[in-house]
């Protein structure tokens, strides 16, 4: 299709080489089409446009994204060629930063249902650069935490070093929806609730004598509870003896509950205590089996291919640790009688 009629938008993504960050492009179709399509800024019944150019499906995923190769080759379907770019409804998510993401991205409806729809497309020219200026060493992170029940703020990473007075007008989005009341480089939250969690995007316009472009940053905000003051507790095994059948395989599971910690480095290991020696056992990786706001339950198994008499002469010890302290639970195997 002819992309010369597409509306054009220029965006700049300046990424930090120190941290992992994501980026998004919204399918910003011209206002009337967008309102019928991507369910953003929906028109009220009184705001009917003179014509309804795109009367396509209301399915939010019915847009098609392409990349325009710089060598003039035909447009490429994003989904087929770029595994690090994911389409979610009308939004394109870039999972990894890098200058190789620079280029022109085009979005348009999948279903063309009226003559007006032919020009219903947006071309976004994305420039991606690594952050070079070290003038702002403490720029806000692309991952920010808000403590539930307290006051907090979300800062726009690309503007966090500027004072509110210097800051240009900022457009904020949360999970793809425009936050029309927010215009400063910082969103202040009077009381944090779990619904404040999400993907926030902050945009502001930068210009030079030739052109203007949108500088965009993406912030992943999570709502958290305060760090635990407790060491982890072992939920299983509960008993310190376990009846087993000799010659049979055996799996002993260790399940431990770890309270929330902002910097979370849980340890869960199995040791064998053989008389007065102890050594760590090579066992399958630990896995998280339940995660809530307040805590996480992690499980790690020890597998014996065949229980022998030797195993009845030693203890199997599960050791768990967080930044507060550690807990152990030992299991003594006992032969099943009869």
């Amino acid at each position: 299709f002819n992309i010369s009629g597409c509306s054009t938008k220029k965006l700049l993504w300046t990424y930090s080489t120190r941290s992992e960050e994501e980026f998004v492009l919204f399918c910003d179709l011209p206002e009337p089409q967008k309102s019928h399509f991507c369910h953003r800024n929906r028109l009220s019944p009184k705001q009917v446009p003179e014509h309804l150019p795109f009367m396509g499906s209301n399915d939010l995923s019915d847009v098609q994204w392409y990349q325009q190769p710089s060598n003039g080759d035909p447009l490429e379907d994003i989904r087929k060629s770029y595994p690090h770019i994911i389409q979610d409804k009308c939004t394109l998510h870039f999972l990894t930063p890098g200058v190789n993401n620079s280029g022109s991205y085009i979005c348009r409806p999948k279903m063309i249902k009226s003559p007006y729809d032919v020009a219903c497309c947006v071309k976004m020219i994305l420039e991606v650069k690594p952050q070079t200026n070290a003038s702002c060493e403490y720029s806000a992170s692309h991952k920010q935490d808000l403590l539930l029940g307290s006051t907090g703020s979300i800062s726009c990473p690309s503007l966090s070093c500027q004072s509110d007075a210097q800051s240009p007008a900022v457009t904020w989005y949360k999970n793809g929806k425009l936050l029309s009341v927010e215009r400063s480089n910082r969103i202040v939250v009077d009381e944090v609730y779990d619904y404040h969690q999400g993907t926030y995007v902050c945009d502001y316009t930068q210009s030079d004598t030739v052109s203007s472009w949108t500088v965009r940053a993406v912030v992943q905000v999570r709502t958290i509870v305060g760090d635990t003051k407790l060491k982890p507790d072992i939920l299983d095994p509960v008993e310190d003896t376990l009846e087993v059948e000799l010659g049979k395989p055996l799996t002993i599971s260790c399940k431990a509950r770890f309270g929330f910690e902002r910097v979370f480095n849980p340890v869960i290991k199995w040791y064998i205590k053989d008389s007065d020696l102890e050594w760590e056992v090579s066992v399958p990786e630990a896995k998280s089996i339940k995660s809530t706001l307040k805590d996480e339950i992690i499980e790690r198994n020890i597998i014996l291919e065949k229980v022998t008499q030797r195993d009845l002469r030693r203890k199997f010890v599960c050791f768990v640790q967080n930044s507060i302290g550690n807990t152990t639970q030992s299991v003594q195997l006992k032969e099943k009688r009869g």
């Epitope: 053989d274 008389s275 007065d276 020696l277 050594w279 008499q309 003594q332």
Partner: antibody
Framework: SLEESGGDLVKPGASLTLTCTAS?????????MCWVRQAPGKGLELIAC???????TWYASWAKGRFTISKTSSTTVTLQMTSLTAADTATYFC??????WGPGTLVTVSS | AQVLTQTPSPVSAAVGGTVSISCQSS????????LSWYQQKAGQPPKLLIY???TLASGVPSRFKGSGSGTQFTLTISDVQCDDAATYYC?????????????FGGGTEVVVK
């Protein structure tokens, strides 16, 4: 630490009981307490072990029948020996496998 | 019953040199690496040097190194000191089925020149 006692000079055919006393720890956390002997100028020979959690015993095949290992308290283990012969002359060590050994007690079987 | 065969005695080593002692088991030890090494000096009880084939016991100099798995094991002493003159024993752990729980090797005497 561990200390053996009961070593003596006895006649062939006699019986003898050796005692091993632990200090500074007890057996509750589970140890293999063993008796090991060493004839003069010879190597180490494991006789028997008892796992102190469940009193599970193990004997070297040659020691079955004449030797009996027992846990008599939370800090003592004994070795009863019967029908002693000159071949049983040795220093008998009590060991908490693997790190802790007593100094040994000498048993001499001679007429 | 399991048999552990050690390098014939005595083995001589020069101060500052390296000496290796081998220990061969008639069957694989438990968990392929449950073998320990002891040092015994005249008139003293044995002292644990290495366990799990290669793990140094606390307080033992790093000049002592254990290696091997299954049925074949080696104790290597590098930068040999006069104090290393002793008899060295390997102790194998087995599955405790049919009387086989532990076995000592016959011992290897190391003479330091």
């Amino acid at each position: 630490s561990l200390e053996e006692s009961g070593g003596d000079l006895v006649k062939p055919g006699a019986s003898l009981t050796l005692t091993c006393t632990a200090s500074g720890f007890d057996f509750s956390s589970g140890y293999d307490m063993c008796w090991v002997r060493q004839a003069p100028g010879k190597g180490l020979e494991l006789i028997a072990c008892i796992y102190t959690v469940n009193d599970n015993t193990w004997y070297a095949s040659w020691a079955k029948g004449r030797f009996t290992i027992s846990k008599t308290s939370s800090t003592t283990v004994t070795l009863q020996m019967t029908s002693l012969t000159a071949a049983d002359t040795a220093t008998y060590f009590c060991a908490r496998l693997y790190k802790l050994w007593g100094p040994g007690t000498l048993v001499t079987v001679s007429s | 019953a399991q048999v552990l065969t050690q390098t014939p005695s005595p083995v001589s080593a020069a101060v500052g040199g390296t000496v290796s002692i081998s220990c061969q088991s008639s069957q694989s030890v438990y968990g392929v690496n449950e073998l320990s090494w002891y040092q015994q000096k005249a008139g003293q009880p044995p002292k644990l040097l290495i366990y799990k084939a290669a793990t140094l016991a606390s307080g033992v100099p790093s000049r002592f190194k254990g290696s091997g798995s299954g049925t074949q094991f080696t104790l290597t002493i590098s930068d040999v000191q006069c104090d290393d003159a002793a008899t060295y024993y390997c102790l194998g752990n087995y599955d405790c089925e049919s009387d086989d729980c532990y076995a000592f090797g016959g011992g290897t005497e190391v003479v330091v020149k």
